[in-house]
Protein backbone atom coordinates (compact mmCIF):
# COMPACT_ATOMS: atom_id res chain seq x y z
CA UNK A 1 0.00 0.00 0.00
CA UNK A 2 1.07 3.56 -0.88
CA UNK A 3 0.65 6.16 1.84
CA UNK A 4 -0.88 9.35 1.55
CA UNK A 5 0.19 12.47 3.63
CA UNK A 6 -2.56 14.79 5.44
CA UNK A 7 -0.90 18.01 7.01
CA UNK A 8 -2.75 20.03 9.69
CA UNK A 9 -2.28 22.88 11.81
CA UNK A 10 -1.60 22.35 15.77
CA UNK A 11 -4.74 23.12 17.72
CA UNK A 12 -6.86 23.09 14.37
CA UNK A 13 -8.94 20.13 13.29
CA UNK A 14 -7.65 17.81 10.58
CA UNK A 15 -9.87 15.49 8.18
CA UNK A 16 -8.85 12.87 6.89
CA UNK A 17 -10.57 10.82 3.90
CA UNK A 18 -10.20 7.04 2.93
CA UNK A 19 -11.84 6.45 -0.78
CA UNK A 20 -13.00 2.87 -1.48
CA UNK A 21 -15.22 0.47 -3.87
CA UNK A 22 -18.44 0.69 -2.44
CA UNK A 23 -19.59 -2.55 -3.69
CA UNK A 24 -16.74 -4.56 -3.04
CA UNK A 25 -16.91 -3.12 0.88
CA UNK A 26 -20.80 -3.41 1.15
CA UNK A 27 -22.10 -4.18 4.46
CA UNK A 28 -18.35 -3.53 5.82
CA UNK A 29 -17.92 -2.16 9.07
CA UNK A 30 -14.82 0.60 8.73
CA UNK A 31 -12.26 1.55 11.44
CA UNK A 32 -9.53 3.80 11.88
CA UNK A 33 -6.31 3.21 13.74
CA UNK A 34 -2.64 3.52 14.42
CA UNK A 35 0.41 2.03 13.43
CA UNK A 36 2.38 1.09 16.96
CA UNK A 37 6.08 0.54 15.31
CA UNK A 38 7.46 -0.52 12.45
CA UNK A 39 6.37 -3.93 12.59
CA UNK A 40 3.90 -3.48 15.40
CA UNK A 41 0.17 -3.41 15.59
CA UNK A 42 -2.24 -1.23 14.17
CA UNK A 43 -3.71 -0.28 16.95
CA UNK A 44 -7.73 0.72 16.99
CA UNK A 45 -8.55 4.31 17.51
CA UNK A 46 -12.51 4.60 16.84
CA UNK A 47 -14.78 2.38 14.13
CA UNK A 48 -18.17 2.92 12.82
CA UNK A 49 -21.60 2.10 14.38
CA UNK A 50 -21.79 -1.36 15.30
CA UNK A 51 -25.03 -1.43 12.66
CA UNK A 52 -23.67 -0.72 9.28
CA UNK A 53 -27.05 0.75 8.18
CA UNK A 54 -26.20 3.13 10.60
CA UNK A 55 -22.04 4.06 9.28
CA UNK A 56 -23.52 7.24 8.76
CA UNK A 57 -23.83 8.27 12.39
CA UNK A 58 -20.25 10.03 13.93
CA UNK A 59 -18.68 8.02 15.92
CA UNK A 60 -16.11 9.63 19.20
CA UNK A 61 -13.33 7.92 20.73
CA UNK A 62 -11.73 11.14 22.23
CA UNK A 63 -11.09 13.66 19.82
CA UNK A 64 -11.11 11.65 16.66
CA UNK A 65 -14.20 11.13 14.66
CA UNK A 66 -15.32 8.63 12.60
CA UNK A 67 -18.01 8.49 9.65
CA UNK A 68 -18.80 6.73 6.77
CA UNK A 69 -20.58 7.19 3.42
CA UNK A 70 -21.22 3.95 2.07
CA UNK A 71 -22.78 4.71 -0.82
CA UNK A 72 -20.16 7.43 -2.24
CA UNK A 73 -17.76 5.42 -0.88
CA UNK A 74 -15.83 7.61 1.13
CA UNK A 75 -14.83 7.16 4.99
CA UNK A 76 -13.95 10.42 6.78
CA UNK A 77 -12.15 10.72 10.14
CA UNK A 78 -11.76 13.92 11.53
CA UNK A 79 -9.28 14.58 14.20
CA UNK A 80 -9.96 17.46 16.49
CA UNK A 81 -7.53 20.20 18.32
CA UNK A 82 -4.89 18.45 16.13
CA UNK A 83 -1.48 18.13 18.60
CA UNK A 84 1.82 17.24 18.14
CA UNK A 85 1.63 13.69 19.62
CA UNK A 86 -1.26 13.37 17.01
CA UNK A 87 1.86 12.93 14.39
CA UNK A 88 1.83 9.10 13.42
CA UNK A 89 1.01 6.21 10.86
CA UNK A 90 -2.65 5.52 10.84
CA UNK A 91 -4.79 3.04 8.65
CA UNK A 92 -8.23 2.97 7.22
CA UNK A 93 -9.79 -0.16 7.37
CA UNK A 94 -12.61 -2.65 6.25
CA UNK A 95 -13.47 -4.94 8.53
CA UNK A 96 -14.80 -8.37 7.75
CA UNK A 97 -15.03 -11.21 10.57
CA UNK A 98 -11.90 -10.65 12.58
CA UNK A 99 -9.79 -9.43 9.63
CA UNK A 100 -8.93 -6.21 7.96
CA UNK A 101 -8.29 -4.61 4.94
CA UNK A 102 -6.26 -1.80 4.77
CA UNK A 103 -8.04 1.15 2.49
CA UNK A 104 -5.51 3.55 2.75
CA UNK A 105 -2.25 4.16 5.12
CA UNK A 106 -2.27 7.98 5.89
CA UNK A 107 0.81 9.68 7.72
CA UNK A 108 -0.56 12.59 9.79
CA UNK A 109 1.63 15.36 10.10
CA UNK A 110 0.93 18.11 12.87
CA UNK A 111 2.50 21.24 11.72
CA UNK A 112 2.86 24.88 13.97
CA UNK A 113 0.50 27.22 13.96
CA UNK A 114 1.04 29.65 11.38
CA UNK A 115 -1.17 32.56 12.93
CA UNK A 116 0.82 31.82 16.87
CA UNK A 117 2.37 34.93 17.84
CA UNK A 118 2.54 36.48 14.55
CA UNK A 119 0.74 39.19 12.54
CA UNK A 120 -1.92 38.77 9.51
CA UNK A 121 0.98 40.81 7.05
CA UNK A 122 3.08 37.82 8.42
CA UNK A 123 1.49 35.02 7.02
CA UNK A 124 3.49 32.11 6.77
CA UNK A 125 2.08 28.57 5.50
CA UNK A 126 4.07 25.12 6.62
CA UNK A 127 5.80 23.59 4.00
CA UNK A 128 4.68 26.22 0.61
CA UNK A 129 8.22 25.68 0.05
CA UNK A 130 8.88 22.46 0.42
CA UNK A 131 9.11 20.32 -2.57
CA UNK A 132 7.23 16.76 -1.45
CA UNK A 133 9.22 14.93 -4.36
CA UNK A 134 6.76 11.92 -4.50
CA UNK A 135 4.40 12.43 -1.75
CA UNK A 136 1.31 13.08 -2.43
CA UNK A 137 0.11 15.80 0.47
CA UNK A 138 -3.46 17.26 1.74
CA UNK A 139 -3.89 20.12 4.30
CA UNK A 140 -6.47 20.87 6.22
CA UNK A 141 -5.91 24.36 4.49
CA UNK A 142 -7.23 22.61 1.35
CA UNK A 143 -3.98 23.02 -0.88
CA UNK A 144 -2.51 20.39 -2.54
CA UNK A 145 1.31 19.75 -3.63
CA UNK A 146 2.82 17.04 -6.23
CA UNK A 147 0.91 14.25 -6.52
CA UNK A 148 1.76 10.40 -6.77
CA UNK A 149 2.89 8.48 -3.63
CA UNK A 150 5.55 7.23 -1.78
CA UNK A 151 5.55 3.72 -0.71
CA UNK A 152 5.57 3.09 3.53
CA UNK A 153 7.20 1.22 5.10
CA UNK A 154 10.49 1.48 2.61
CA UNK A 155 12.30 -1.15 2.73
CA UNK A 156 16.10 -0.18 4.72
CA UNK B 1 23.93 -0.25 15.72
CA UNK B 2 21.08 2.92 15.45
CA UNK B 3 24.00 6.34 14.93
CA UNK B 4 23.73 9.00 13.40
CA UNK B 5 26.96 10.98 12.03
CA UNK B 6 27.74 14.22 11.50
CA UNK B 7 29.51 16.59 9.28
CA UNK B 8 32.99 18.22 10.46
CA UNK B 9 32.97 21.73 12.78
CA UNK B 10 33.04 25.29 11.03
CA UNK B 11 33.70 28.94 11.21
CA UNK B 12 31.71 30.71 9.60
CA UNK B 13 31.44 34.60 9.10
CA UNK B 14 28.56 36.68 10.32
CA UNK B 15 26.47 36.91 7.28
CA UNK B 16 26.76 33.70 5.72
CA UNK B 17 25.65 30.62 5.31
CA UNK B 18 25.95 27.09 6.95
CA UNK B 19 24.88 23.48 5.91
CA UNK B 20 25.30 20.05 8.40
CA UNK B 21 24.54 17.10 7.78
CA UNK B 22 23.56 14.02 9.70
CA UNK B 23 24.18 10.71 8.26
CA UNK B 24 22.16 8.15 9.62
CA UNK B 25 22.62 4.39 10.19
CA UNK B 26 21.46 0.91 11.61
CA UNK B 27 17.47 1.84 11.30
CA UNK B 28 14.59 2.71 8.24
CA UNK B 29 15.50 6.25 7.89
CA UNK B 30 12.51 6.98 6.16
CA UNK B 31 10.45 6.14 9.29
CA UNK B 32 11.21 8.60 12.35
CA UNK B 33 11.71 11.89 12.34
CA UNK B 34 14.90 14.32 12.57
CA UNK B 35 15.07 16.78 14.86
CA UNK B 36 17.46 19.89 15.00
CA UNK B 37 18.46 21.04 18.30
CA UNK B 38 21.43 23.33 19.17
CA UNK B 39 23.28 24.66 22.29
CA UNK B 40 25.45 27.58 22.87
CA UNK B 41 28.99 27.66 24.88
CA UNK B 42 28.25 26.42 28.71
CA UNK B 43 24.39 26.84 27.74
CA UNK B 44 20.77 24.74 27.68
CA UNK B 45 19.52 22.94 24.62
CA UNK B 46 17.13 25.11 22.12
CA UNK B 47 14.98 22.68 19.72
CA UNK B 48 15.10 24.14 16.17
CA UNK B 49 12.72 22.09 14.44
CA UNK B 50 12.04 18.80 12.71
CA UNK B 51 12.01 16.75 9.46
CA UNK B 52 9.84 14.13 8.60
CA UNK B 53 12.39 11.96 6.20
CA UNK B 54 9.34 10.31 4.42
CA UNK B 55 7.23 13.08 3.50
CA UNK B 56 10.12 15.68 2.94
CA UNK B 57 7.97 17.62 5.62
CA UNK B 58 9.33 20.44 8.07
CA UNK B 59 8.37 22.48 11.04
CA UNK B 60 10.45 25.01 12.50
CA UNK B 61 10.27 27.19 15.40
CA UNK B 62 8.88 30.41 14.88
CA UNK B 63 12.38 32.38 16.27
CA UNK B 64 14.32 30.60 13.55
CA UNK B 65 11.34 30.89 10.16
CA UNK B 66 12.72 32.25 7.51
CA UNK B 67 16.54 32.08 8.57
CA UNK B 68 16.46 27.70 8.46
CA UNK B 69 16.03 24.96 6.17
CA UNK B 70 16.12 21.66 6.54
CA UNK B 71 15.84 18.83 3.75
CA UNK B 72 16.95 15.59 3.67
CA UNK B 73 18.57 12.87 1.04
CA UNK B 74 16.87 9.88 1.34
CA UNK B 75 19.28 7.64 -0.99
CA UNK B 76 22.08 8.29 1.12
CA UNK B 77 19.81 8.82 4.55
CA UNK B 78 21.21 11.83 5.24
CA UNK B 79 19.69 14.86 6.98
CA UNK B 80 20.76 18.79 6.61
CA UNK B 81 20.06 21.99 8.22
CA UNK B 82 21.22 25.10 6.98
CA UNK B 83 20.84 28.64 8.75
CA UNK B 84 21.44 31.51 6.96
CA UNK B 85 22.29 34.94 7.72
CA UNK B 86 24.55 34.11 10.23
CA UNK B 87 25.24 35.92 13.66
CA UNK B 88 28.03 35.69 16.61
CA UNK B 89 24.97 34.38 19.06
CA UNK B 90 24.47 31.49 16.21
CA UNK B 91 27.93 29.99 17.55
CA UNK B 92 27.24 27.19 19.23
CA UNK B 93 27.42 23.00 18.57
CA UNK B 94 24.06 22.15 16.64
CA UNK B 95 22.96 18.68 16.68
CA UNK B 96 20.73 16.11 15.42
CA UNK B 97 18.52 13.99 16.94
CA UNK B 98 16.12 10.87 15.85
CA UNK B 99 12.49 10.78 17.67
CA UNK B 100 11.60 7.61 19.60
CA UNK B 101 8.27 7.44 17.44
CA UNK B 102 7.72 5.61 14.94
CA UNK B 103 6.42 8.55 12.25
CA UNK B 104 5.37 10.51 15.32
CA UNK B 105 7.05 12.77 17.90
CA UNK B 106 7.93 11.50 21.67
CA UNK B 107 10.84 12.07 22.57
CA UNK B 108 14.84 12.63 21.16
CA UNK B 109 16.20 9.04 21.62
CA UNK B 110 19.34 8.73 18.99
CA UNK B 111 21.58 11.96 18.81
CA UNK B 112 24.46 12.69 16.66
CA UNK B 113 27.89 13.94 18.12
CA UNK B 114 26.97 17.67 17.56
CA UNK B 115 28.70 19.73 14.86
CA UNK B 116 30.64 23.60 16.27
CA UNK B 117 30.21 26.29 14.16
CA UNK B 118 31.75 29.30 14.80
CA UNK B 119 30.57 32.88 13.53
CA UNK B 120 33.01 35.04 14.29
CA UNK B 121 34.90 37.89 11.90
CA UNK C 1 5.27 29.19 24.24
CA UNK C 2 5.79 27.01 27.05
CA UNK C 3 8.83 27.76 29.80
CA UNK C 4 9.88 24.67 31.60
CA UNK C 5 11.81 25.98 35.30
CA UNK C 6 14.25 23.10 37.07
CA UNK C 7 14.74 22.95 40.48
CA UNK C 8 17.06 23.39 41.86
CA UNK C 9 19.46 25.09 39.44
CA UNK C 10 22.24 22.88 41.14
CA UNK C 11 21.86 20.04 43.61
CA UNK C 12 25.56 18.98 45.59
CA UNK C 13 24.80 15.30 46.48
CA UNK C 14 26.97 12.11 47.91
CA UNK C 15 27.51 9.33 45.48
CA UNK C 16 24.53 6.80 47.60
CA UNK C 17 22.28 9.53 48.05
CA UNK C 18 18.69 10.14 46.73
CA UNK C 19 18.34 13.02 43.93
CA UNK C 20 15.20 14.62 43.39
CA UNK C 21 14.98 17.00 40.27
CA UNK C 22 11.93 19.17 39.47
CA UNK C 23 10.68 20.44 36.05
CA UNK C 24 7.48 22.88 36.56
CA UNK C 25 5.59 23.99 32.89
CA UNK C 26 4.13 27.14 32.37
CA UNK C 27 0.89 25.42 31.39
CA UNK C 28 -0.24 21.77 31.04
CA UNK C 29 1.92 19.76 29.02
CA UNK C 30 -0.32 16.19 29.83
CA UNK C 31 2.35 13.53 30.31
CA UNK C 32 4.33 14.62 27.44
CA UNK C 33 7.54 15.64 29.28
CA UNK C 34 11.07 13.55 28.51
CA UNK C 35 14.43 14.20 30.57
CA UNK C 36 17.59 13.88 29.07
CA UNK C 37 21.22 13.81 30.80
CA UNK C 38 24.48 15.55 29.65
CA UNK C 39 27.93 15.17 30.58
CA UNK C 40 30.87 17.58 29.54
CA UNK C 41 31.53 17.28 25.61
CA UNK C 42 28.77 14.92 24.85
CA UNK C 43 25.46 14.76 23.54
CA UNK C 44 22.64 14.53 25.36
CA UNK C 45 20.71 10.92 26.52
CA UNK C 46 17.10 10.24 26.40
CA UNK C 47 16.40 8.93 30.50
CA UNK C 48 12.53 8.95 30.37
CA UNK C 49 9.68 9.64 27.89
CA UNK C 50 6.33 10.05 28.45
CA UNK C 51 6.62 11.31 31.71
CA UNK C 52 7.56 7.99 33.74
CA UNK C 53 8.69 5.38 30.94
CA UNK C 54 12.22 4.32 31.01
CA UNK C 55 14.01 4.69 27.76
CA UNK C 56 16.11 1.40 26.52
CA UNK C 57 19.02 0.82 28.51
CA UNK C 58 18.26 3.25 31.14
CA UNK C 59 18.77 1.95 34.46
CA UNK C 60 15.95 1.59 37.07
CA UNK C 61 17.40 4.01 39.54
CA UNK C 62 16.18 6.34 36.80
CA UNK C 63 12.18 6.90 37.27
CA UNK C 64 10.06 9.95 36.38
CA UNK C 65 6.76 11.01 37.60
CA UNK C 66 4.09 13.97 37.08
CA UNK C 67 1.81 15.15 34.61
CA UNK C 68 0.16 18.34 33.97
CA UNK C 69 2.23 21.31 35.10
CA UNK C 70 4.49 19.12 37.59
CA UNK C 71 7.14 17.11 37.45
CA UNK C 72 9.82 14.89 38.73
CA UNK C 73 12.99 12.75 38.22
CA UNK C 74 14.39 10.47 40.91
CA UNK C 75 17.83 8.93 40.79
CA UNK C 76 17.20 6.30 43.83
CA UNK C 77 21.25 6.03 45.05
CA UNK C 78 23.49 8.10 42.74
CA UNK C 79 26.44 6.23 40.97
CA UNK C 80 29.52 8.02 39.74
CA UNK C 81 28.51 8.15 36.77
CA UNK C 82 25.33 10.20 37.19
CA UNK C 83 27.01 13.57 38.30
CA UNK C 84 25.95 15.52 34.91
CA UNK C 85 23.70 17.92 33.74
CA UNK C 86 19.88 16.96 33.60
CA UNK C 87 16.83 18.42 30.98
CA UNK C 88 13.69 18.49 30.74
CA UNK C 89 11.74 18.69 27.30
CA UNK C 90 8.56 19.50 26.38
CA UNK C 91 6.39 18.05 23.12
CA UNK C 92 3.24 18.88 24.03
CA UNK C 93 3.05 22.19 22.04
CA UNK C 94 5.16 24.13 19.90
CA UNK C 95 7.84 25.08 19.92
CA UNK C 96 8.86 22.12 21.60
CA UNK C 97 10.84 23.81 24.77
CA UNK C 98 13.76 22.69 27.11
CA UNK C 99 13.98 23.57 30.54
CA UNK C 100 17.28 25.14 31.81
CA UNK C 101 18.68 22.02 33.22
CA UNK C 102 19.91 20.85 36.78
CA UNK C 103 23.69 20.16 37.45
CA UNK C 104 23.81 17.11 39.96
CA UNK C 105 27.17 17.65 41.30
CA UNK C 106 29.60 15.66 43.60
CA UNK C 107 29.66 17.48 47.14
Known amino acids: HNTTVFQGVAGQSLQVSCPYDSMKHWGRRKAWCRQLGEKGPCQRVVSTHNLWLLSFLRRWNGSTAITDDTLGGTLTITLRNLQPHDAGLYQCQSLHGSEADTLRKVLVEVLADPLDHRDAGDLWFPGESESFEDAHVEHSISRSLLEGEIPFPPTS | QVQLVQSGAEVKKPGASVKVSCKAS????????MHWVRQAPGQGLEWMGW????????NYAQKFQGRVTMTRDTSISTAYMELSRLRSDDTAVYYC??????????????WGQGTMVTVSS | EIVLTQSPATLSLSPGERATLSCRAS??????LAWYQQKPGQAPRLLIY???NRATGIPARFSGSGSGTDFTLTISSLEPEDFAVYYC?????????FGGGTKVEIK
Open chain 2, 97 to 110: ARDLGYSSLLALDI
Open chain 2, 26 to 33: GYTFTGYY
Open chain 2, 51 to 58: INPNSGGT
Open chain 3, 27 to 32: QSVSSY
Open chain 3, 50 to 52: DAS
Open chain 3, 89 to 97: QQVSNYPFT
